[in-house]
Structure formats: C-alpha cells, structure tokens
C-alpha cells in the first residue's frame, strides 16, 4: 500500500506523458489524477514505465473503479493488463471484440495465462455463445484454444462458428471434445459437395459415428491412414472389409503398417480372416473360417 502524500509543487500531471517515468512511486500516486489516467490510458502503453510504476497506476484505477473497469479503459490497458489478476478481470464486462483482440495482443507469443483464460471466459459468457468472429480471433492467438474447452463449453459453439476452425485447432482435442464438435461440423458443411465436404469435415472425423463413416465410403474420398487412425475405435469396428476398402481407396495398403495399432488392430479382430485375405495385404488375426460369430447384443436383448 502506497502512503498518501501531497504532490510536490509543480509536479501535478496535466497529461500522461514520458515525463512521468522520472516520477517516484509515491509521486505517481500523489500527482497523477485517476480520472486523467482513465481518459488517457491509450498513452500508457507508449511510455516505458517500470513494473513498480505500473503497479501504482493499476492501484489508482482500482480506487477509481472498485466495481471493475469500464470497457473504454480496458481496451487501452496494454501492458497494464499483465498486472491484472483473475479476480480483477472477473469484475469486467467486456463486450467488444476489439477490446479482446487488444488484450490478447499484449499476451501474444506466451502460453495462455490464468488472466487470459478468465478474460476469454468473461467475454464468451457475455456473448452467450462462441460465435464465428470470436472463435476466429481466439484460435488465431491460441490454436489449441478449442481443445482447452470442456465438452459442456463446446456445446455452446454454434455450427456457423465451425467455419472458423482450422485443422491445427483440433490437434489436441480428445474424443469427447470431437464427439461434441463433429455433429456441428456436419451441420455446418452439409450443403457442400462430396470432395469439398470431406476436406472440411476430415479434421472432425474423430467424433464421427459408424453410419457416417459408411456413408463417406460412398463418396470416393480416399481417406488417408493418419485420419483413419484418429477415428473412434467403436465407430470403426462395425465397418466391413469392403467399406474400409472403399473408404481408404488406394490408401488401403497402409493398413498393413498399422495392423498392430488401434483402431486397425481391433478392427482386424472383428473381421473374418477370409474377408481380410481378399485385400491381399497379409493382414492376420481375423476370425478363422468356419467359426461362428455370435451377436452378443442380440443375446443380451433376449435374456
């Protein structure tokens, strides 16, 4: 806490300018009017204040706005934003995307800090949903942003926002997150033709159900093995050998290199060896010829 001391004669700040960098902490506290600081926040960023001096300026704003800063001040916080705590930010009501961008710019190149996470949370909650422009902005600054959200949070993403998602934005998403995002992507891209649709939906396929994979096999998509390996195991298991062959097209030969890895390994175990042999890839581990395959789900339903 800085002591309240009178401002020395002639030192009263008329405007926020570079002369203030020579002020001691107590002089800043005594000589800079909080209201003046608030109206000229845009100048603070251009002045090389020390961290200690920034602490004083923040203190002055906290006193002026105990209930939280107005957006006109927040937008121009600049490096002063780095001094804010999540508790400070929870008091804010940020509605402008420009404000969000300005603050994210300050933290650019760094990991998402608790302050940034709180800011984003406040912003998104204020908007009610994660719209396309917001998602565009957030993923531009933090490619992993989408995958940092819980499935519950992702449920507020409208299908229209999916257009802003790039493949790299989904790199760290787990199956539960893709389960939520995939139906939205399917809805968003539903009016595209076959090949264009596949290009867009490909990154989301880790959330696709069996039926959609079977349907994709009808579109001559030639799915690559990297994409196939990211599919849900439970969605791949019911696919027939013919469907996998049609889905992968010329890439079907890549199954051999992946036969010990999921989901290929588990899929092989579900196929008749005779059917696997027709691929001519030397895949082993299928159900031997003559063995009966029991449909246990039917048995459970009857018991």
């Amino acid at each position: 806490e800085v002591e309240k001391t009178a401002c020395p004669s002639g030192k009263k700040a008329r405007e926020i300018d570079e002369s203030l960098i020579f002020y001691k902490k107590w002089e800043l506290e005594a000589c800079v009017d909080a209201a003046l600081l608030a109206t000229q926040m845009d100048r603070v960023n251009a002045i090389p204040f020390t961290y200690e001096q920034l602490d004083v300026l923040k203190h002055k704003l906290d006193e002026l706005y105990p209930q939280g800063y107005p957006e006109s001040v927040i937008q121009h916080l600049g490096y002063l934003f780095l001094k804010m705590s999540p508790e400070d930010i929870r008091k804010w009501n940020v509605t402008s995307l420009e404000t969000l961008k300005a603050l994210l710019e300050v933290n650019k190149g760094h990991e998402m800090s608790p302050q940034v996470a709180t800011l984003i949370d406040r912003f998104v909650k204020g908007r009610g949903q994660l719209d396309k422009d917001t998602l565009d902005t957030l993923t531009a600054f933090y490619p992993g942003y989408l995958c940092s959200l819980s499935p519950e949070e992702l449920s507020s993403v409208p299908p229209s926002s999916i257009w802003a998602v790039r493949p790299q934005d989904l790199d760290t998403c787990d199956p539960r997150q893709l389960d939520v995002l995939y139906p939205k992507a399917r809805l968003a891209f539903q009016n595209m033709n076959g090949s264009e649709y596949f290009v867009k939906i490909q990154s989301f396929l880790g959330g696709a159900p069996t039926e959609d994979l079977k349907a994709l096999s009808q579109q001559n998509v030639s799915m690559d093995l990297a994409t196939f390996m990211k599919l849900r195991t439970d969605a791949v298991l019911p696919l027939t050998v013919a469907e996998v062959q049609k889905l992968l097209g010329p890439h079907v030969e890549g199954l051999k290199a992946e036969e010990r890895h999921r989901p290929v390994r588990d899929w092989i175990l579900r196929q008749r060896q005779d059917d696997l042999d027709t691929l001519g890839l030397g895949l082993q581990g299928g159900i031997p010829n003559g063995y009966l395959v029991l449909d246990l789900s039917m048995q459970e339903a009857l018991s």
């Epitope: 039926e211 349907a215 049609k246």
Partner: antibody, heavy 117, light 95 residues
Framework: ELLLVESGGGLVKPGGSLKLSCAAS????????MSWVRQTPEKRLEWVAT????????YYPDSVKGRFTISKDNAKNNLYLQMSSLKSEDTAMYYC??????????WGQGTTLTVSS | ASLGDRVTISCRAS??????LNWYQQKPDGTVKLLIY???RLHSGVPSRFSASGSGTDYSLTISNLEQEDIATYFC?????????FGGGTKLEIK
Amino acid sequence: ELLLVESGGGLVKPGGSLKLSCAASGFTFSDYFMSWVRQTPEKRLEWVATISNGGTYTYYPDSVKGRFTISKDNAKNNLYLQMSSLKSEDTAMYYCARFDGYYFDYWGQGTTLTVSS
Amino acid sequence: ASLGDRVTISCRASQDISNYLNWYQQKPDGTVKLLIYYTSRLHSGVPSRFSASGSGTDYSLTISNLEQEDIATYFCQQGNTLPYTFGGGTKLEIK
C-alpha cells in the same frame, strides 16, 4: 441362413402409388446399407435406391429422385420402397439387396410392379 | 457355348472405375447371386472355375469348364461412383 423376401408388388395405374416391403433375416440388419434394384421387361438391371444402416442417408439415381423414398425399420428388420407418381417405365421386377461398400452381396427373389392403365 | 468349354465374357466401362467391378449371375428363374467383386475376388461359396480379371476400363469374367448349372445371364456392375450401373447382361446358352 441369410434371407431377403420382397412383397407388395402389383398392378398400378400411371400416376399412382405403391409401397414395396422386404423382410430381412439371418444377419444384423442394422449394420448394413440396403438397396433396391429393378429389372426391366428388357432384362436390364437398374439401381433404384440405397439407404444407410441407420437410415440417415439415402441415395437415388435421377430417374426416381423425388418420386421414390427408401426407408428401413431396424427394429422389424424391414426395408421399404414408397413409390409415387408412377410411370409405365417403372414397370419391372423389384429386388431387395444387401449392399456392402460397393457391391450387392445378397438378393431377394423379387416382386413385380406393373404400371399400366 | 458347349458344356466343358472355357467361356469368357467382357465388360467395358466408359471411364476408369479403379477395379470396382463386380459380376452377378442370374438364373432363368430370376435368382440373382454375386459371383465376383473388386475385379477378381470370389464371393463365398462360388466355385473356383469362375475367375475374373481386368483394370481401368476393361474387365472380363471366365468360366474355365462350363457346367449345366452355369447356364444363366451374367451382369457386370461398377461400384466406383454413384449412380451404380450395370452392364446389359450376357446370356449363356448351350449349343
């Protein structure tokens, strides 16, 4: 034993409607895409419709699009083909077939539709 | 054709169908069965006297030793792209 049994064929006037059925047994119906294929009086085979295993996706050639609707009831193991605005050129033997990836691996015995005034 | 003959039936596609070519047999009573899929793969239960080959746009079905039960009409079908289409059929008759 895998069985597909069609029914519902008959004589219909041009512009009329008819619904064909196919009862399936001997396999897990809900796992497979199903199709209708017809054979014209000139003995040409024509693919008519395909439906995905869960019934979400349907596929038709231009010749029947908007007039025919394929559907399936996985609880009853039944496949259907609702035909409307029928034309004389729809006269054919209609086969129900199981579809696997890119081929029709099992066929029913067929049911006959005649469209004539 | 005569019983015991080697019979070859051809099928030509209007464009490359990437080996997604299937063969069906229709008996005189109307029963249809899949014989061969993906150019040369025998469907389960099909006798080994049936074989097939081809690539690109040209495909063929061969019956190495014609038997009475093979008297039928044979259809080819492309499964490469929708709409799936069938050939006009080749009817085998005994001389």
